[in-house]
């Protein structure tokens, strides 16, 4: 009997109510391999997701995200809600970087802007909410008399990240 | 294809078991959410904790459940179930189930592991 | 936290008759509803997903209807291999700290 399963070809489950018969899989399910003895459900992409690939009989569909969201995995298992340059996706939704950290993409926490007195540099360009500091030389190596930029504001903890 | 839970055991009040859900026909290399769900004897089915076994890794969790049990991807065929400070509550007949839907619904299960707690 | 209320929990039918069980969640759920029957010592077995399409190997006297918060399991020309526990399923993943899933009481089904 089990052979007779084993050559249930992809497309098509091994029917025990019906004497090992290869049956087509039902509506919105599939199989992606031969010899199987259920078909798997279709993933329905609605809501936040969009169709990218419809299901098959023999392969599952694949969804994107719809606008003003990001997939998560590779797979795009989850849709997370893109916030501005400058904001982070907290539990509460998007939120503003706290002073000292910045965020320059749609996704992603808040990061604290670059110590540059920490490899010697001073802050050639301030840092801001989606920009993070550039760094200079070292105040040595400004010529006597220039003027020094200003040092860097103390880097504080990024806002709540999601999970 | 089919699953094989294991691990199951008479425990005391406060012990920790693992129980392990060993898939056979298929690999996690396609994505599924793998899931626990329990059901005491002579009671309803209850969800326990889902793992989406893609690249997110992704672990869902019954309120109830979150903090004492923790569902883990051990290998490409492998998922456990880690539960800590059992209590006679806990004693159930412990599934493996497998969803590819991504809206809890299991077409595939396994035969069940019992745990049981009691002093 | 998502509660699916499924009544009633015991029903009795004739061979050829039907029966018909209900169940309520406690939010919107879209289609995101299976049915499962279980049978004593054995693990549930799949029915219904998506609240009406049939799973693979399951007998076409089964049906699944509804959307939204209401739904319904028909059998229709019991058999004496129906005597089981039914159980609605509902939920969808949303994010790991707000996760909705839930298995309704059950519905044990006597063929008289």
């Known amino acids: 009997l089990q052979d007779l399963c084993s050559n249930c070809p992809a497309g098509t489950f091994c029917d025990n109510n019906r004497s090992q018969i290869c049956s087509p899989c039902p509506p919105n399910s599939f199989s992606s391999a031969g010899g199987q003895r259920t078909c798997d459900i279709c993933r329905q992409c609605k809501g936040v997701f969009k169709t990218r690939k419809e299901c098959s009989s023999t392969s599952n569909a694949e969804c994107d995200c719809i606008s003003g969201y990001h997939c998560l995995g590779a797979e795009c298992s989850m849709c997370e809600q893109d916030c501005k340059q400058g904001q982070e996706l907290t539990k509460k939704g998007c939120k503003d970087c706290c002073f000292g950290t910045f965020n320059d993409q749609k996704r992603g926490i808040c990061r604290p802007w670059t110590n540059c007195s920490l490899d010697g540099k001073s802050v050639l360009v301030n840092g801001t909410k989606e920009r993070d500091v550039v760094c200079g030389p070292s105040p040595a190596d400004l010529s006597p008399g220039a003027s020094s930029a200003t040092p860097p504001a103390p880097a504080r903890e990024p806002g709540h990240s999601p999970q | 294809q089919s699953l094989e839970e294991a691990g199951g055991d008479l425990v005391k009040p406060g012990a920790s078991l693992t129980l392990t859900c060993t898939a056979s026909g298929f690999s996690f290399t396609s994505s599924y959410y793998m899931c626990w769900v329990r059901q005491a004897p002579g009671k309803g089915l209850e969800w326990i904790a889902c793992i989406y076994t893609g690249s997110s890794g992704s672990t869902y969790y019954a309120n109830w459940a979150k903090g004492r049990f923790t569902i883990s991807k051990t290998s490409s065929t492998t998922v456990t179930l880690q539960m800590t400070s059992l209590t006679a509550a806990d004693t159930a007949t412990y599934f493996c189930a497998r969803d590819s839907s991504s809206y809890y619904m299991f077409n595939l299960w396994g035969q069940g592991t019992l745990v049981t707690v009691s002093s | 936290a998502l509660v699916m209320t499924q009544t009633p929990a015991s029903v009795s039918a004739a061979v050829g008759g039907t029966v018909t069980i209900n169940c309520q969640a406690s939010e919107d759920i879209d289609n995101y509803l299976a049915w499962y029957q279980q049978k004593p010592g054995q693990p549930p077995k799949l029915l219904i997903f998506?609240?009406?399409d049939l799973a693979s190997g399951v007998p076409s006297r089964f049906s699944g209807s509804g959307s939204g918060t209401q739904f319904t399991l028909t059998i229709s020309g019991v058999q004496c291999d129906d005597a089981a526990t039914y159980y609605c399923q509902g939920g969808y993943y949303t994010s790991s700290t707000d996760t909705r899933g839930a298995f309704g009481g059950g519905t044990e089904v006597v063929v008289k």
């Open positions: 998506y609240a009406s």
